[in-house]
């Protein structure tokens, strides 16, 4: 293979890989026809002048996870064909000016996970063909104006996980081709008006995990192609009325972990493509009519872990495509019977950890496709007759941790649970709270002969009017559905956001008989 160094492996495809702690300098001689060179996990601390001089055909160079702290300005001389250069996961604090000079073909430059303290306009002034620049995981405190002015072809810029406290409104002004801009996990407290105005092709903007308190009203007005906007884990306390008005392509918006107290009607939209809206961990106390009415394609709405005590009957108007609604861990005591009436496609609803004392009999009347209902840890003593009768797809119902009153009025609910037992999975059985003689007993095995007669209604009406799937030989298979009711953060579509997905505690919505018990 034209002379492969002993500490490296060389493949027929002109790929060279040099790894191991015993390597302390760039191995020589490298095969002249090498097109890809990887130097990984070595003890190389510096790159001297022209170590790659004889491999001018090189297209990709990865020098990652080393002890590299110093690079001579001429280290990459004669690599005019190089398209991909990664220096990620090293110990670089300073980049010499002119380091990338002559790399006329360079398209991807990865400098992430180093200790860079600053960048200057002269660093990248020669990289006119650069499409991707990764600078996340460094110690940058500011970006000087002009730093990216020559990178007119740049499509992806990652500045996340640095120490940026402010951004100049001019720093991105020439990046008209930029599609992805990541500024997550910095110390930004505000973003000046106009900062993103030049980013007319931007598709993703990641601003999560900063300290942003206010959003300028027109901050995103020029970003008509924006598809993903991450604003979670900031200090945003209010949303200017027009802040999201010009985002017709948006399909993911995260606002969880802020300090939002209220949502005004029309604040979201029109966003015909928005599929997911994450608003958990805020301080929202009520939801007015039509607050989400512009979100006609919304499928996931997460409002858990707020302080919601009131939901207007028309709050969810327009959400005809909603599949998952999470309202758990709020302060709800009552729900209007029509509040979910428009949610014809709803599959999963989580209402656990509230203060619900009762549910209207028609609460799920138009929501025929429900597969999972979480009602645990509320103040429910009984449920209305027939409340679940029409829910033929229901395969998870959680009712535990409620103060069930097991007088004769509970029999219809008990019977319903038993009738639907083979196709209704639950991990914890509801337990009687009152009267005292049955406290602590499972609701579905209470001795009905000693249950206290009801003081409410002498004759218990029928419940359900007809059991599910009457007169059928077997129950349909339970359906397993991906759970989002217990998610603590959405899954971003890139890995360097360091967000996590925590799935439901049993990882199932519907349990089969074999899994249950």
């Amino acid at each position: 293979y034209h002379g492969c160094p002993s500490e490296c492996t060389c493949s027929r495809a002109s790929q060279v890989e040099c790894t191991g702690a015993r390597i302390v300098a760039v191995p020589t001689p490298l095969p002249w026809n090498a097109m890809s060179l990887q130097i990984l996990n070595t003890h190389i601390t510096e790159l001297n002048e022209s170590p790659f001089l004889n491999i001018s055909a090189l297209i990709a160079l990865r020098i990652e996870k080393n002890e590299l702290s110093r690079i001579t300005p001429g280290a990459f001389r004669n690599l005019g064909s190089l398209r991909y250069l990664s220096l990620a996961n090293n110990k670089l604090q300073v980049l010499p000016i002119g380091l990338f000079q002559g790399l006329d073909s360079l398209e991807s430059l990865l400098l992430s996970s180093n200790q860079l303290l600053q960048i200057q306009p002269a660093h990248f002034s020669q990289c006119s063909n650069l499409k991707e620049l990764q600078l996340h995981g460094n110690h940058l405190e500011y970006i000087p104006d002009g730093a990216f002015d020559h990178l007119v072809g740049l499509t992806k810029l990652n500045l996340g996980k640095n120490s940026l406290t402010h951004i100049s409104p001019r720093v991105f002004q020439h990046l008209g081709n930029l599609q992805v801009l990541r500024l997550y996990e910095n110390r930004l407290t505000d973003i000046p008006m106009g900062t993103f105005d030049g980013l007319v092709n931007l598709q993703e903007l990641a601003l999560q995990q900063n300290q942003i308190g206010l959003l300028s009203p027109g901050l995103f007005h020029n970003n008509h192609n924006l598809q993903r906007l991450y604003l979670s884990n900031n200090h945003i306390s209010q949303l200017p009325p027009s802040v999201f008005m010009q985002l017709p392509q948006l399909n993911r918006l995260t606002l969880f972990g802020n300090s939002l107290k209220e949502l005004s009607p029309g604040i979201f939209g029109p966003m015909p493509n928005l599929r997911e809206l994450w608003l958990y961990d805020n301080h929202i106390s009520s939801l007015p009519d039509n607050v989400f009415s512009n979100l006609r394609q919304l499928q996931v709405l997460i409002l858990s872990r707020n302080q919601i005590s009131f939901i207007s009957p028309g709050a969810f108007n327009g959400l005809t495509e909603l599949r998952e609604l999470s309202l758990h861990t709020n302060a709800l005591q009552d729900l209007d019977g029509n509040v979910f009436r428009m949610l014809a496609n709803l599959q999963n609803i989580s209402l656990q950890n509230n203060r619900l004392r009762q549910l209207p009999g028609n609460i799920f009347a138009n929501v025929n496709g429900l597969m999972a209902i979480q009602l645990q840890n509320n103040q429910l003593e009984n449920l209305p007759l027939g409340i679940f009768d029409h829910l033929g797809k229901l395969c998870e119902l959680r009712l535990y941790d409620n103060p069930w009153r097991c007088d004769s009025d509970i029999l219809p609910l008990r019977n319903w649970l038993l009738l639907n037992q083979p196709r209704l999975g639950t991990d914890t059985v509801p337990v009687c709270f009152s009267p005292a003689n049955v406290r602590g007993q499972s609701l579905i095995i209470i001795n009905v002969n000693v249950a206290v007669p009801s003081v409410h209604v002498p004759e218990v009406p029928s419940y359900p009017e007809t059991p599910w799937y009457p007169d059928t030989p077997s129950y349909p298979d339970t359906t397993s559905v991906s759970s989002t009711t217990e998610l603590t953060s959405p899954v971003e579509d890139y890995t360097d956001l360091t967000t996590i997905q925590v799935t439901d505690d049993r990882s199932v919505w519907g349990m089969t008989q074999a899994q249950s018990g």
């Epitope: 029999l411 019977n415 038993l418 499972s442 095995i445 009406p461 009017e465 059991p467 009457p470 074999a514």
Partner: antibody, heavy 113, light 111 residues
Framework: EVQLQQSGPELVKPGASVKMSCKAS????????IHWVKQMPGQGLEWIAY??????KYNEKFRGRATLTSDKSSSTAYMELNSLTSEDSAVYYC????????WGQGTTLTVSS | DIVLTQSPASLAVSLGQRATISCRAS??????????MNWFQQKPGQPPKLLIY???NQGSGVPARFSGSGSGTDFSLNIHPMEEDDTAMYFC?????????FGGGTRLEIK
């Protein structure tokens, strides 16, 4: 006091039908399931079906030959068996609730020509 | 269908002693964390009488000498101390899923 009173013995010819009853008292009829169970002479017990507020669930073995109905106004459950053969000769019980906590005294059916 | 196998088929126990009847299910009869296994006593010419429901809960008016235990697929009915009146047929039954099924029965008599 909870009671299930079943109709008297039946002697029918092969191929005929029979309808037996189970009248409930001492509790709210609509709050509980009523099961029907077959026991052939000197044999074990065999579950036929249940009825609850007009909804029914049958053992496949009896589907199409057993029909359960109820009359809420009189708190009475009924089971009709058709196309009878000698194998249907047995005592038929009605029982209450999912846990079969109260049983009727049984209706003896004899199928003979 | 879930098949229930009772053992022994017949059992003779001295007065005052312990009688133990076993019932094994072909698959688990647990659901909601509850075992849907019931036990019945039947005397000649009488309907069955519920003794134990949901594996270990005593039926109404059932003497304390009758107790049930078990979970999953293995269950037992214990009678202690044995009395003359306990001579009868005993059946286990699962109510986990349709069709509900009964064991073949155990004949218990005085030794």
């Amino acid at each position: 006091e909870v009671q299930l009173q079943q109709s008297g013995p039946e002697l029918v010819k092969p191929g005929a039908s029979v309808k037996m009853s189970c009248k409930a008292s001492g509790y709210t009829f609509t709050s509980f399931v009523i099961h029907w169970v077959k026991q052939m002479p000197g044999q074990g017990l065999e579950w036929i079906a249940y009825i609850y507020n007009d909804g029914t669930k049958y053992n496949e073995k009896f589907r199409g030959r057993a029909t359960l109905t109820s009359d809420k106004s009189s708190s009475t459950a009924y089971m009709e068996l058709n196309s009878l053969t000698s194998e249907d000769s047995a005592v038929y019980y009605c029982a209450r609730d999912f846990y079969f906590d109260y049983w009727g005294q049984g209706t003896t059916l004899t199928v003979s020509s | 269908d879930i098949v229930l196998t009772q053992s022994p088929a017949s059992l003779a126990v001295s007065l005052g002693q312990r009688a133990t009847i076993s019932c094994r299910a072909s698959e688990s009869v647990d659901y909601y964390g509850i075992s849907f296994m019931n036990w019945f006593q039947q005397k000649p010419g009488q309907p069955p009488k519920l003794l134990i429901y949901a594996a270990s809960n005593q039926g109404s008016g059932v003497p304390a000498r009758f107790s049930g235990s078990g979970s999953g697929t293995d269950f037992s009915l214990n009678i202690h101390p044995m009395e003359e009146d306990d001579t009868a047929m005993y059946f286990c039954q699962q109510s986990k899923e349709v069709p509900y099924t009964f064991g073949g029965g155990t004949r218990l008599e005085i030794k």
